[in-house]
Interface confidence: medium
């Protein structure tokens, strides 16, 4: 039978009844244009929602936006555009909330075409109230955050100047004019390219890169002859041009860019192009792109300075510059990611890694799922996930991957179950143990979110009719209750549900159509009666992350340590509640081979774990060195794995060796840098 | 009903050598990692040695490193620990015990007796 | 290595007193602790494990609390049959290590 009508299924008693009691139906006096939501603060309730409407006239478009707020998680909103003076806001910046629970907000106007500059609205207390200012400038970007002051704003203008705030907007000034790119790294500090010729685009691969920390009163230029940057975890990148010829190469700092050293990643010619695809404080995922149109590159994976790689993963799906990919971070689970590799036949097949990339896998079969067509071997296949590409690709996939932090081991996703990712209307998996077995969920597409910290789970079917049924299941989607919200159907446009899964408010948004006008409607359920008590000891049980033996003591070892986590069983119907934190208690595992990478100049034999030294290191790999202050690198040709926590057991000693003699480079020097002062 | 049976105890001159073993029976002993725990006389417990249950991995405490050997046959449900270049503080009532996944040692031998003496 | 200290070394109580025994460690340990029985003649028997849990099959008046250094095993209501010594061990990394032990006597 399909998931969800066995025998077992044990109903939610009374759920019609006490979900009619907590279902809060919205009308919002609006013709249908776009409606865009955000949440201001955690765990405050309260919700801005902005719809525009554009009625094209003959000569401009006229716009009308409207603001709501709402401080019961959408339960109730109120009209509040009389506050931002019934003005026209700008969908494309979208609304600025600030960082944490600063309670700040910042809403960019639309002005007329003859202005001095531009307008925001801004609020400090949770969009209770807006203060209009005008600015001595047009914005080209959405106002950026300092991520440790949330007075401290910075705006890219339209004539590429740099503009920074110190007093949450209030007054404005230009520290730096000829600005492709501005972005906040720690402690304040603003990066950002500089042009000195033309255009942003005409000096691409001649920008300086400059840096501030005392925003805008002294700068230092970093790097010269730079094509892009980026900022991931401790890690400041830039690629650079080489001297003699259009490739360019990745080099890196952890000092905020006093010192660079190259990264020991191929360089990369005009047309490709290197991509962070994820970056903590120990390492860093690099996507580099193959020659040509492939469509395809490969993963490497940084050791804890960001300089020495490891080829993490060939073959890896990523479509042109800024393209698609399909590379999920699993939060559920630590060590777990999830992305798409283009295989010689053209195919699309989803590969898992548990350790950080250090050895990828196909997904295993779901139990309960039969091989599709794509398999040549109907008893032998994997489960292929839809993500990003697939949703570019308009396949009929409404929602990416889904996972959790507090929501430990679960995953949902979009997925169909063969060889290949198939382009057949695919179903709803789910994973509660972090991605080693799967179930199917749902059949067909669906949206889904998880509430409640995994307590609940609900789900739409995406269809092309109005819809009316919402899914919920209290035990991590193996049984599921239907609930019809509304009489009367809705055009179903999306599920918004509070970040961070802590919420048991779910809102369902459409619009309803009638002969003559079309309307914005929500409707927000509070699954609080459904788990009626709150969670206790009893509803708990132990798990063991990653387990795959459960009987060994090894078991469950990644990145050099255990975790068990106390998980909520799935037969308990209860409330984790907002304050829920997910207990865990790691142990240390002993130290194997396992939990070293090969140092530069060192690499892995195929089938040994033993890193051993490269006969010469000749041609272009001679580029591949560490610099600094210091030339020369010291190594035992062993280095931990970033984030290895591992203690003991195995200890790699090596003979010391200077590879000073085997260096040659030109790189971001620091006599190539200099300082001035406003 | 599980059990844990050690043997193998008995006098040794110092320097000399003794194997200890420990029948397994009433579990899957194939799927436990299996510890070494000794107890000397009106001393506290310490611990040995532990093996994984594929027996790929053995970890010993300092004190018996590169002396002892912890290891194990699955086709026979036993454990065995070779001890070497014994000396008089290796005096102790030597227990198995086994070692689920959550590293706990949940079930014990009676223990045997190892004396080193001139 | 990580030192385990137990207290008290011995106590004297009688049937149905709550009898409390704790164990510091030397260094944070979460909660990788188990609490062992040992009675004359007989095998050790594991209790406690993860500093809560209490092994299928022991009576419900065990139970352990505490995380990161500091453990409690509570005996609620001493029986007859618990006059024995109890031990505590952590296993958060190795060598694995002991407590010296608390001894239950009848007073």
């Known amino acids: 039978s399909a998931p969800g009508e066995d025998e077992e299924c044990g109903r939610v008693r009374d759920f019609v009844a006490k979900l009619a009691n907590n279902t809060h139906q919205h009308v919002f006096d609006d013709l249908r244009g776009s409606v865009s939501l955000s949440w201001v603060g955690d765990s405050t309730g309260v919700i801005l929602v902005l719809t525009t409407f554009h009625v094209p006239l003959v000569i401009m478009t006229f716009g009308q936006s409207k603001l709501y707020r709402s401080e019961d998680y959408g339960k109730n909103f109120k009209d509040i555009t009389d506050l931002i003076n019934n003005t026209f806001i700008r969908t494309e910046f979208g609304m600025a909330i600030g960082p944490e629970n600063s309670g700040k907000v910042v809403l960019t106007a639309e002005v007329s075409g003859g202005s001095r500059g531009g307008r925001i609205f801004r609020s400090s207390d949770f969009a209770k109230n807006f203060v209009q200012t005008d600015l001595p400038f047009h914005p080209l970007t959405q106002m950026m955050y300092s991520p440790q002051n949330s007075d401290y704003l910075l705006a890219l203008s339209t004539e590429n100047g740099l503009w920074v705030s110190k007093n949450f907007g209030g007054k404005w000034e230009e520290i730096h004019k000829a600005v492709c790119l501005a972005k906040w790294g720690s402690d304040n500090t603003i990066f950002f390219t500089t042009y000195a010729n033309g255009s942003c685009k005409a000096d691409l691969g001649a920008l300086e890169l400059w840096r501030t920390s005392d925003l805008g009163k002294s700068f230092k230029t970093i790097g010269v002859k730079i094509y892009s940057f980026g900022l991931g975890g401790r890690f400041l990148f830039a690629s650079v041009m080489a001297d003699k010829d259009t490739t360019r190469r990745i080099h890196v700092s952890t000092d905020q860019g006093d010192t660079w050293s190259m990264a020991q990643l191929p360089s990369v010619g005009q047309e490709q192009f290197y991509s962070i695809l994820a970056a903590n404080d120990d390492m860093v995922f690099m996507h580099v792109d193959e020659p040509g149109d492939t469509g395809f590159g490969t993963i490497f994976t940084s050791d804890d300075r960001g300089i020495v790689y490891s080829k993490s993963l060939d073959r890896h799906l990523y479509t042109t510059t800024g393209g698609e990919t399909d590379f999920t971070n699993v939060t559920s689970l630590r060590g777990v990611y999830i992305t798409s590799v283009l295989s010689e036949d053209n195919s699309i097949q989803t590969m898992i890694t548990f350790d950080q990339g250090g050895r990828w896998t196909h997904l295993r079969k779901p139990e309960n799922s039969e091989c599709d067509a794509t398999a040549k071997n109907k008893n032998e296949c994997s489960l292929h996930i839809h993500a990003s590409y697939s949703i570019s690709q308009k396949l009929n996939v409404p929602m990416a991957p889904l996972s959790e932090p507090n929501a430990v081991g679960i995953v949902i996703a979009h997925g169909s179950v063969g060889d290949a990712i198939s382009v057949m209307v695919p179903d709803v998996y789910i994973s509660d143990d972090g991605g080693y077995s799967w179930t199917k969920m749902l059949e067909g597409p669906h949206y889904y979110t998880i509430l409640d910290s995994g307590g609940i789970i609900v789900a739409i079917e995406h269809s092309s009719r109005p819809i009316n049924v919402i899914k919920f299941s209290t035990d991590e989607g193996q049984c599921w209750q239907t609930y019809t919200f509304t009489r009367d159907p809705i055009y179903f446009t999306g599920l918004a549900s509070e970040p961070g899964a802590r919420s048991m408010n779910i809102s369902i948004w459409g619009f309803t159509e009638s002969f003559l006008t079309s309307q914005w409607v929500s409707y927000t359920i509070d699954f609080k009666d459904i788990l009626e008590r709150n969670c206790e000891e009893k509803d708990y049980t132990i798990w063991l992350a990653h387990s795959t033996d459960p009987e060994d003591y090894e078991d469950g070892c990644i990145l050099g340590y255990k975790e068990q986590f106390l998980r909520l069983r799935k037969s308990s119907v209860c409330q984790n509640g907002r304050d829920y934190v997910v207990t865990k208690q790691p142990s240390i595992c002993l130290c194997s081979l396992e939990d070293f990478l090969c140092d530069f100049g060192y690499y892995r034999p195929e089938n040994d774990s033993k890193c051993v030294e490269q006969p010469e290191l000749k041609g272009h790999d001679l580029e591949f060195c560490l610099y600094g202050r210091e030339e020369h690198l010291t190594t035992n040709g062993y280095r931990k794995i970033p984030g290895d926590k591992c203690q003991g057991g195995v200890n790699p000693v090596r003979e010391v060796k200077d590879l000073k003699k085997k260096c040659t480079s030109n790189f971001l020097s620091p006599e190539k840098q200099n300082s001035k002062s406003n | 009903e599980v059990q844990l049976v050690e043997s193998g105890g008995g006098l040794v001159q110092p320097g000399g050598s003794l194997r200890l073993s420990c029948a397994a029976s009433g579990f899957t002993f194939s799927t436990y990692g299996m510890s070494w725990v000794r107890q000397a006389p009106g001393k506290g417990l310490e611990w040995v040695a532990i093996i994984s249950s594929g027996g790929s991995y053995t970890y010993y405490s300092d004190t018996v490193k590169g002396r002892f050997t912890i290891s194990r046959d699955n086709s026979k449900n036993s454990l065995y620990l070779q001890m070497n270049s014994l000396r008089a503080e290796d005096t102790a009532v030597y227990y198995c015990s086994r070692s689920s996944s959550h590293w706990y040692f949940d079930v014990w031998g009676q223990g045997t007796l190892v004396t080193v003496s001139s | 290595d990580i030192q385990m200290t137990q207290s008290p070394s011995s106590l004297s109580a009688s049937v149905g007193d709550r009898v409390t025994i704790t164990c510091h460690a030397s260094q944070g340990i979460s909660s990788n602790i188990g609490w062992l029985q040992q009675k004359p003649g007989k095998a050790f028997k594991g209790l406690i494990y993860?500093?809560?849990n209490l092994k299928d099959g022991v009576p419900s008046r065990f139970s352990g609390s505490g995380s990161g250094a500091d453990f409690t095993l509570t005996i609620s209501s001493l029986q007859p049959e618990d006059f024995a010594t109890y031990f505590c061990v952590q296993y958060a990394q190795f060598p694995y290590t002991f407590g010296g032990g608390t001894k239950v006597e009848i007073r």
């Open positions: 993860h500093g809560t």
